[in-house]
């Protein structure tokens, strides 16, 4: 008697399950290779396919790149072979693992290619304000595909003390609810820290000039 293999204990059929995948957000730089990961289990053995921006994507059919695709795996690495390579592969990727019992789908993987960090050279005019007024010191960090951290410091690399009166917004701007003459400094510097590149870019110093008003003088 021949027992169909699907009934044999060690040949139990299993639908595909994604076991490993790239993070939802992947930032590459011009010199990086692009590696997208997709591993899945299932019996019979799963077949893999990818889409980019909803369109079928076959890494090995891409022109002008070297592709390494792992056997029995959906993972692949594209080796960049020129200075304009990474930008071409930006997009939203998705991996599909299929066998005759069904298809498993990875989450969307957003691949972003980072350009050179740029902060326009600018002449920053002094910010003039009267004591007691509110003021905003703008940061306007350069656009970045990766999350960045903003710090405000002075030229001695000391952090600007923040409290309920002086706070930093999510956009990186420094907000003063009411300025004091002690806030009068010529070196408020916004620093943008790109953790992925371990790069820190600093903006031109902002000169905050606080004028004491008569009413403030009278109060003293």
């Amino acid at each position: 008697i021949q027992i169909p293999e699907e009934y044999e204990g060690h040949h139990v059929m299993e639908p595909p399950v994604i076991t490993e995948q790239s993070p939802r957000r992947l930032v590459v730089f011009p010199t990086d290779d692009i590696s997208l990961k997709c591993e899945a289990s299932g019996k019979p053995e799963v077949q893999f396919r990818w889409t980019r921006d909803g369109v079928h994507f076959k890494p090995k059919e891409e022109l002008g790149v070297t592709v390494y695709q792992s056997p029995h795996s959906g993972s692949f690495t594209i080796t960049g072979n020129n200075s304009n390579f990474a930008q071409r592969f930006q997009g939203i990727y998705r991996c599909f693992a299929s066998n005759k019992l069904g298809t498993a789908m990875s989450h969307e993987i957003r691949l972003m290619a980072e350009g050179a960090p740029k902060w326009p050279k600018e002449t920053v005019k002094p910010v003039e304000v009267e004591e007691g007024e509110s003021v905003v010191l703008p940061c306007n960090p350069p656009p970045s595909a990766e999350p960045l951290r903003i710090y405000w410091m002075n030229s001695k690399i000391l952090h600007i003390k923040q409290d309920e009166r002086v706070t930093m917004g999510q956009n990186g701007n420094l907000y003063f609810a009411n300025v004091l003459t002690s806030d009068n400094h010529s070196d408020y510097i916004c620093h943008a820290h790109f953790p992925g590149t371990r790069t820190i870019i600093q903006k031109e110093p902002i000169d905050l000039r606080v004028k004491a008003t008569n009413s403030m003088i009278d109060r003293k």
Partner: antibody, heavy 117, light 107 residues
Framework: EVQLVQSGGGLVQSGGSLRLSCRAS????????MLWVRQRPGKGLEWVAE????????NYNEKFKTRFTISVDRSKNTLYLQMDSLRAEDTAVYFC??????????WGQGTLVTVSS | DIQMTQSFSSLSASVGDRVTITCRAS??????LNWYQQKPGKAPKLLIY???RLHSGVPSRFSGSGSGTDYTLTISSLQPEDFATYFC?????????FGGGTKLEIK
């Protein structure tokens, strides 16, 4: 701020050699491709070669492949162009540039190479 | 190699003029077209990359457009500092190639 500072140009006899340098600062050196572009007197721009400082992968303009060698020293954040068997027609200003992914985002100040015959 | 042709080697214009500089590729370059400005004795500076994206610090009077093989750089209102030579460059296929340049002169 990204800065590319060039050195090494000068006068050389036909058939001679010269090595150009380009010191990079203000960014993570291994993140961006580096390129050489030249400009002959009164002429347009001509791409010479490029290198990926992370893995030393190179591309050359076929015209220069046998005589010019592009390289980097990661410990010094410096790009080089070794030029051998120089000819009078190699007289040009040579620029180094940083490849930001689409274009040559930043350029060195240029260095003049004069080949006398 | 992809040939890049800038049909005018020089153009004359006055301050305040709207100026258009054209560039044609010998084959489709899929928008991988960059524009550079060069002043005498200086290095080129990137103005526009990927057809229409303004490089940081470049004034908004500069803009780029085009597709396929035909591309345009426009300066909406010419300023004294804009008199220079402009080069296009394709970044689609190695070897990277440049147009011959268009020198913008004062009328």
């Amino acid at each position: 701020e990204v800065q590319l500072v060039q050195s090494g140009g000068g006068l050389v006899q036909s058939g001679g050699s010269l090595r150009l340098s380009c010191r990079a600062s203000g960014y993570t050196f291994t993140r961006y491709w580096m390129l050489w572009v030249r400009q002959r007197p009164g002429k347009g721009l001509e791409w010479v070669a490029e290198i990926n400082p992370r893995n030393d992968r190179t591309n050359y303009n076929e015209k220069f492949k046998t005589r010019f060698t592009i390289s980097v020293d990661r410990s010094k954040n410096t790009l080089y162009l070794q030029m051998d068997s120089l000819r009078a027609e190699d007289t040009a200003v040579y620029f180094c540039a940083l490849g930001g992914g689409y274009a040559m985002d930043y350029w060195g100040q240029g260095t003049l190479v004069t080949v006398s015959s | 190699d992809i040939q890049m042709t800038q049909s005018f080697s020089s153009l004359s214009a006055s301050v305040g003029d709207r100026v258009t500089i054209t560039c044609r590729a010998s084959q489709d370059i899929s928008n991988y077209l960059n524009w550079y400005q060069q002043k005498p004795g200086k290095a080129p500076k990137l103005l526009i990359y990927y057809t229409s994206r303004l490089h940081s610090g470049v004034p908004s009077r500069f803009s780029g457009s085009g597709s396929g093989t035909d591309y345009t750089l426009t300066i909406s209102s010419l300023q004294p500092e804009d008199f220079a030579t402009y080069f296009c460059q394709q970044g689609n296929t190695l070897p990277w190639t440049f147009g011959g340049g268009t020198k913008l002169e004062i009328k």
